[in-house]
Amino acid sequence: SRLRQEDFPPRIVEHPSDLIVSKGEPATLNCKAEGRPTPTIEWYKGGERVETDKDDPRSHRMLLPSGSLFFLRIVHGRRSKPDEGVYVCVARNYLGEAVSHNASLEVAILRDDFRQNPSDVMVAVGEPAVMECQPPRGHPEPTISWKKDGSPLDDKDERITIRGGKLMITYTRKSDAGKYVCVGTNMVGERESEVAELTVLER
């Protein structure tokens, strides 16, 4: 085919941006290109071409008419992580190709299983009490808070310190007795540990 005067090579006019998305949620990596003839767009992750519904109708990834890559749901397991990585879109026509900036897609996860559940504690009034938990693995790293008898623990109480997975009460009162739960939270949601009972005995 002859080169037509009005034809021009592709250029990327909208680059994809870095994303952090919860597992199972939809996501879009944007890409828009100009060129004449209209360029075709393909996506690559880590140097491998990304399969979309154009290759397999059952794919959870769709190439939109705009050139954007749409994920019906982000797929991410313990060992298989097909969607996580660094993506580029490539626009091509007969005059050449244009490559977008890199865009990283990170997957936010929060597993179900606490690595350590808090244990029951029994102390005398006035003694210190310590409960410890390790939240489920997560990305971003989950923050830890505590509930007592179903309500968020008042960490403004100067006797109470929450550091890492440790809940420390420097000197216990009878009113501290109750059922405690460790809560791990990130952008995915929250997970509650098994219940641990704090028993405060009269001296």
């Epitope: 399969e51 298989s80 097909p82």
Partner: antibody, heavy 118, light 105 residues
Framework: EVQLVQSGAEVKKPGASVKVSCKAS????????MHWVRQAPGQGLEWMGW????????KFPQKFQGRVTMTRDTSITTAYMDLSRLRSDDTAVYYC???????????WGQGTMVTVSS | DIVMTQSPSSLSASVGDRVTITCRAS??????LNWYQQKPGKAPKLLIY???SLQYGVPSRFSGSGSGTDFTLTISSLQPEDFATYYC???????FGGGTKVEIK
């Protein structure tokens, strides 16, 4: 079409090694963990370990450590399982299986029969 | 290692029967449990993942339930093609249960 195609049946002598291949097609090879599972005649399924095709890192249950090697060649989207110091009780059908993002083995190879006999 | 115990190891049933197979984990595994079907001379086939999610293309007569340590695979109305061996697998440590063979009565 997503599929795993394994190498053909093997007959080996005790003490020898066997290398089984598993050619993946129809999906992004580097994105999915690859596992090996075996099944002795008339017995159940026994998980042998897995390889991360992206990094080449492997993990095996204690039973197979030191005797099994798992490798991959990303340029030809093929995983390999090498079992050494073969014994008669290694006679089994060996399967490769892809692990989905839902932590389950959703695609299996057709199996490779390995017979260990003197 | 987490040990998976399936019961029964075999059962006889008729077409149309409701069949239940159980799998017990030696420690809590949340919902990290899968079920597979295997026919003689064939590779296993995934039926259920994450304890209760039906794999694409699997008939709705198959269902899974349970969490923690006790899990169940149910076939609501047994069909001739369902006579096979069924395996549970925990997806944390990846070990399989011993299998349940479903035979024709």
């Amino acid at each position: 079409e997503v599929q795993l195609v394994q190498s053909g049946a093997e007959v080996k002598k005790p003490g020898a090694s066997v290398k089984v291949s598993c050619k993946a097609s129809g999906y992004t090879f580097r994105g999915y963990a690859m596992h090996w599972v075996r099944q002795a005649p008339g017995q159940g399924l026994e998980w042998m370990g897995w390889i991360d095709p992206r990094t080449g890192l492997t993990k095996f249950p204690q039973k197979f450590q030191g005797r099994v090697t798992m490798t991959r060649d990303t340029s030809i989207t093929t995983a390999y399982m090498d079992l050494s110091r073969l014994r008669s009780d290694d006679t089994a059908v060996y399967y490769c299986a892809r692990e989905s993002g839902d932590d389950a083995f959703d695609i299996w190879g057709q199996g490779t029969m390995v017979t260990v006999s003197s | 290692d987490i040990v998976m115990t399936q019961s029964p190891s075999s059962l006889s049933a008729s077409v149309g029967d409701r069949v239940t197979i159980t799998c017990r984990a030696s420690q809590k595994i949340s919902s990290y449990l899968n079920w597979y079907q295997q026919k003689p001379g064939k590779a296993p086939k995934l039926l259920i993942y994450a304890a209760s999610s039906l794999q694409y293309g699997v008939p709705s007569r198959f269902s899974g339930s349970g969490s923690g340590t006790d899990f169940t695979l149910t076939i609501s109305s047994l069909q001739p093609e369902d006579f096979a061996t069924y395996y549970c697998q925990q997806s944390v440590g990846l070990f399989f249960g011993g299998g349940t063979k479903v035979e024709i009565k």
